[in-house]
Amino acid sequence: MSSKYPRSVRRCLPLWALTLEAALILLFYFFTHYDASLEDQKGLVASYQVGQDLTVMAAIGLGFLTSSFRRHSWSSVAFNLFMLALGVQWAILLDGFLSQFPSGKVVITLFSIRLATMSALSVLISVDAVLGKVNLAQLVVMVLVEVTALGNLRMVISNIFNTDYHMNMMHIYVFAAYFGLSVAWCLPKPLPEGTEDKDQTATIPSLSAMLGALFLWMFWPSFNSALLRSPIERKNAVFNTYYAVAVSVVTAISGSSLAHPQGKISKTYVHSAVLAGGVAVGTSCHLIPSPWLAMVLGLVAGLISVGGAKYLPGCCNRVLGIPHSSIMGYNFSLLGLLGEIIYIVLLVLDTVGAGNGMIGFQVLLSIGELSLAIVIALMSGLLTGLLLNLKIWKAPHEAKYFDDQVFWKFPHLAVGF
């Protein structure tokens, strides 16, 4: 089996990626500058740490979480890094153009980088549904479309519904999940005979996927609190996320054992379910007033995640062609919805408590926001899927799905590395 790209892709990818990079450099040259204000250096370092946490989540956490395929682990990690690097650049520009540009140049601050990393994270969540079935040239398209769609969604929600950065970014879970699933739906599905083994997980890659899950687990509180406005809100968000993910780990491991006839624990269930609590409390992490509530949500999220991992893969594999171990898409779609529903329930409780019809209006607005996020995710995902099906991208043949050797140079050209 040749380890080379097809000739057409060898011409297409470097040209496409480097032209795009040159265009980005020009855009940065003409339209951006750094925030030059004097600032306390200690404060600067503290502020940078949040951005660093997000980068670790994206590069190591999501990079390794998606690396559990027997013969697609290299590509998963490296392609994730490639998409993150590209996505952050485009997200900084896009966010600047959408929010600051009328005033002149786009000012780049640590906050812009934080925001851009979170936008790029959306792509890394979505891509789990299609990794192994697309090449880098296609992934570049996916990054550009998804970051643009998410940026515009956030801008629309901010303008129409007047929500702050935290609230409109927390739609990322639902948006990324539905975007990824709709892209996957458009791609060729059936794995031809003889390639089924490639989408199976292996021990060493599964261990690296667990490492990814651990990094995500450790830094999820930073993700949920990164865009909040005051220290009180951030502190509350960090605590609640921590309690929720702690409980979802216990639930995931015990629930996984419970779901197996012999009481065995499934690696795949655990990889995703440990994060369940963090996703479920995302939208309302700063609003939950006490640990026990966050813990209950973590428990419910863990159970839903394990239940989803047990019953949904069959359906997703059949309908969307998503392999059994790529469960982030449907996991996040369920848990993201749970998170949004929790927030809406809080508003409903307010309505009941206050007897104020106007809070009911707030409930409608929140449902409107969620619906808009799902609709834009599905539409832009379908558009991306259709674009990725174009012949010009020279997509890997179905027989070469989930195969590192299609993309990487291995000196020994071993088949079963």
Epitope: D40, V50, S158, N162, D164, R229, S230, N236, L287, L346
Partner: antibody
Amino acid sequence: QVQLVESGGGVVQPGRSLRLSCAASGFTFSSYGMHWVRQAPGKGLEWVAVIWYDGSNKYYADSVKGRFTISRDNSKNTLYLQMNTLRDDDTAVYYCAREGTLYSSSWYRRYYYYGMDAWGQGTTVTVSS
Amino acid sequence: EIVLTQSPGTLSLSPGERVTLSCRPSRYIASDYLAWYQLRPGQAPKLLIYGASSRATGIPDRFSGVGSPTDFTLTISRLEPEDFAMYYCHYSGGSPPYPFGQGTRLDIK
């Protein structure tokens, strides 16, 4: 007690620059967002800019975007407003204000409220040729 | 961008009277982020009400605020001589900019 003292105001020609400072004391400066607000002669209050408690995020009114820069030095408990390309309509009394975050809780939810709960006495900026 | 419209522009009343000032946003806003300020000549502004209805520390109970997301009011139940001043509503939620209303002037009759 909480004290905010603005300085740096004065008379300046159009197109020139000025830097306002606001020295804070009596509270943990690094835990609060800070605002600049101005009042032009005979006009109402106009919000100018805000900076988050850690300095990571800044927002500006459309009328000053691209010309004014808000910053803070938490080690010196000081807030700044760098004003470039000043115009006649920037003539005003400039106040710095602390953004208080207050909250209350029910059994199921915490509510956050924001209000500028401490203000300086203001510093006057006159832009005139 | 949200615009806050205050009405009336000016009111002339006597001490002891009750007054209600209105603040209307151009579109829906969350009441958690609406505040009222008092500005007396030559003094710094003072926070009266936050979260549309909660009195700030040290503010007498004759000041009260209520509001739905489309209409907010500040009520002073019995006017005292020191209450004659400018009153501004301000919104600081969602996405900036954070606008002030144009103000209501309360004059002594």
